[in-house]
Interface confidence: medium
Amino acid sequence: GELETSDVVTVVLGQDAKLPCFYRGDSGEQVGQVAWARVDAGEGAQELALLHSKYGLHVSPAYEGRVEQPPPPRNPLDGSVLLRNAVQADEGEYECRVSTFPAGSFQARLRLRVLVPPLPSLNPGPALEEGQGLTLAASCTAEGSPAPSVTWDTEVKGTTSSRSFKHSRSAAVTSEFHLVPSRSMNGQPLTCVVSHPGLLQDQRITHILHVSFLAEASVRGLEDQNLWHIGREGAMLKCLSEGQPPPSYNWTRLDGPLPSGVRVDGDTLGFPPLTTEHSGIYVCHVSNEFSSRDSQVTVDVLDPQEDSGKQVDLVSAS
């Protein structure tokens, strides 16, 4: 006769491991008992369990409640056992020793491999600001056994670097994603992808990029200078900028206080019916936590009764 087993049994942490040991004997042969032991190199054999044809399954106190026979129907020549709820410490070499009559004893070894799936974590880097050089956007760490694979999935241009730390029964892998921040990256997803033989599918953690910036400010509303004349209603100036975080707007007049009746509504400055006292230099001040910008314009309200033309100067200052 001969023993049938597996060279390697692979199981995911927490699952049940079937340790196979089947005696394929000649007719009339009987299995008296099957002894299972752990036989890691450098250590003595530690009994796991013993299946006896007469006395049944005996389990070592160290494995009490964790070793069972497979569910019926059972073949009397089958000495397989189930190791419940596999833990990392179960990984190692096991020996099955079968005592048969009249052929004698047979033994076989197998290796139990316990896969420990990773629980990845993603840590964003420092705040990203436009104008910085190469900056850490995020790091992703995953620990498992064997070592997991950590990669990045993104449309953003950047560079990656990885390092690995080996522990006694596992390995931790950390991958960093570096980039040169630009406003076009705002709202873009940066996804850490972790692959491992113990996972049914890749694990993905997505971080949305936020890049602080503030665009140059400009003022609209003075494009047609002939519209800025005494008596005109609905005249307005609009300050244009964009930023992350979204900016706030403030209007002032450089050559004095804002005239009465002028309404400030965020980025817009609304005028009552125009008079010559509305002529002056107006400043839009745009700011967010990252930066601030100014843009100033000169308003010259025309008196239609005068022949002189209206002159408008546009000046931007940062």
Epitope: A35, Y55, S99
Partner: nanobody, 118 residues
């Protein structure tokens, strides 16, 4: 030939404890399985518990959680700690040992009486 000698039996009240011992006349390392059976008056011999040379154990459902089998290979002795005894545990308790070579050879002791009164 292996001689097995039991001791520790006696009379005890329900809920009490006893510890049986079985000494073997040769090294228990070569004895693959040792254990205990019992036989009540007018009944068949009944399996109680067994222990392997490596310390793995098995129990009959009727005693699981109340009885504990242990083994001292250095002293060539097997023990049965019996707690929470019940009147239905009254029987003659026999030590058994099995040697595995080309075929199983089973040895028996002469038995020790355990009586549990209510």
């Amino acid at each position: 030939e292996v001689q097995l000698v039991e001791s520790g039996g006696g009379l005890v009240q329900a809920g009490g404890s006893l510890r049986l011992s079985c000494a073997a006349s040769r090294s228990t390392f070569s004895l693959n399985i040792m254990g205990w059976y019992r036989q009540a008056p007018g009944k068949q011999r009944e399996y109680v518990a067994t222990i392997t040379s490596g310390g793995s154990t098995n129990y009959a459902d009727s005693v699981r959680g109340r009885f504990t089998i242990s083994r001292d290979n250095a002293e060539n002795t097997v023990y049965l700690q019996m707690d929470s005894l019940k009147p239905e545990d009254t029987a003659v308790y026999y030590c058994t040992a099995e040697l595995v070579r080309r075929g199983p050879t089973t040895y028996w002791g002469r038995g020790t009486q355990v009586t549990v009164s209510s």
